[in-house]
Interface confidence: medium
């Protein structure tokens, strides 16, 4: 069986973000107020190195109050 590298790029990254964020949308770079390493975006954190579900979740959008 294929051994996963634990990195996410391209379409796989988008697909997994849709799973983690549940269709509420996501950012490729978090708003400055939510990020400690301001220069990094999700591609650098999850495509160039490995990341987990908790880190992916920090890129989910938090829309204005729902209907």
């Amino acid at each position: 069986a294929y051994r996963p590298s634990e990195t996410l790029c391209g379409g796989e990254l988008v697909d997994t973000l849709q799973f983690v964020c549940g269709d509420r949308g996501f950012y490729f770079s978090r708003p400055a107020s939510r990020v400690s390493r301001r220069s990094r975006g999700i591609v650098e954190e999850c495509c160039f190195r490995s990341c987990d579900l908790a880190l992916l979740e920090t890129y989910c959008a938090t829309p204005a109050k729902s209907e």
């Epitope: 634990e6 990195t7 983690v20 549940g22």
Partner: antibody, heavy 115, light 105 residues
Framework: QVELVESGGGLVQPGGSLRLSCAAS????????MSWVRQAPGKGLEWVSY????????GYADSVKGRFTISRDNSKNTLYLQMNSLRAEDTAVYYC????????WGQGTLVTVSS | DIVLTQPPSVSGAPGQRVTISCTGS????????VHWYQQLPGTAPKLLIY???KRPSGVPDRFSGSKSGTSASLAITGLQSEDEADYYC?????FGGGTKLTVLG
């Protein structure tokens, strides 16, 4: 039509190991992420693990992290779940489910962990 | 952690309308899409409603879903005996506790 068929369940002692398989047909296998979801006897559904469509990424529920490993073989259209250090609370029917919305499910395979 | 709360059971007579609620908080149901699954006795779950209110092909229009604020609902009209099953709501990888629907009579 879409078909998912799980196998590999059975009776195993606490601390033992088991590998589940899920054979897929009827859709473009390598285009879909897959998950394992389990259901303890008489209980509700619990998501266990996720793997992205190329197999590059995996995610796990806290209850199985470090003990279970999900993988896929895109040349065989098959999903796997390697379960180690099994506990009594892992006793459940294990289902494989397609995609990010779990739009198709297999029939399930029963895993019983008991001495 | 995300928690989704469903009533353990609901019941109705054939032909009636029943609703099943799924309650969370503004940080989950308020922002995520909700999916519903039907599990007939002794069978695997089946996707019934996705993205709050959309029906997969083959699901009768007697089944409908809605979402408002921190709660989602599944409505079944024209209740039939074959609707007797367990129903689960979910958002992403978290499931509600399930609701057993009993069709009376």
């Amino acid at each position: 039509q879409v078909e998912l068929v799980e196998s590999g369940g059975g009776l195993v002692q606490p601390g033992g190991s088991l590998r589940l398989s899920c054979a897929a047909s009827g859709f473009t296998w390598s285009s879909f992420a897959m998950s394992w979801v389990r259901q303890a006897p008489g209980k509700g559904l619990e998501w266990v693990s996720y793997i992205s469509y190329l197999g590059s990424y995996t995610g796990y529920a806290d209850s199985v992290k470090g003990r279970f490993t999900i993988s896929r073989d895109n040349s065989k259209n098959t999903l796997y779940l390697q379960m180690n250090s099994l506990r009594a609370e892992d006793t459940a029917v294990y289902y494989c489910a397609r995609g990010t919305k779990f739009d198709y499910w297999g029939q399930g395979t029963l895993v019983t962990v008991s001495s | 952690d995300i928690v989704l709360t469903q009533p353990p059971s609901v019941s109705g007579a054939p032909g009636q309308r029943v609703t099943i609620s799924c309650t969370g908080s503004s940080s989950n149901i308020g922002t995520y899409d909700v999916h519903w699954y039907q599990q007939l006795p002794g069978t695997a779950p089946k996707l019934l409603i996705y993205s709050n209110s959309k029906r997969p092909s083959g699901v009768p229009d007697r089944f409908s879903g809605s979402k408002s604020g921190t709660s989602a609902s599944l409505a079944i009209t024209g209740l039939q005996s074959e609707d007797e099953a367990d129903y689960y709501c979910s958002i992403t990888r978290v499931f509600g506790g399930g609701t057993k629907l009993t069709v009376l009579g």
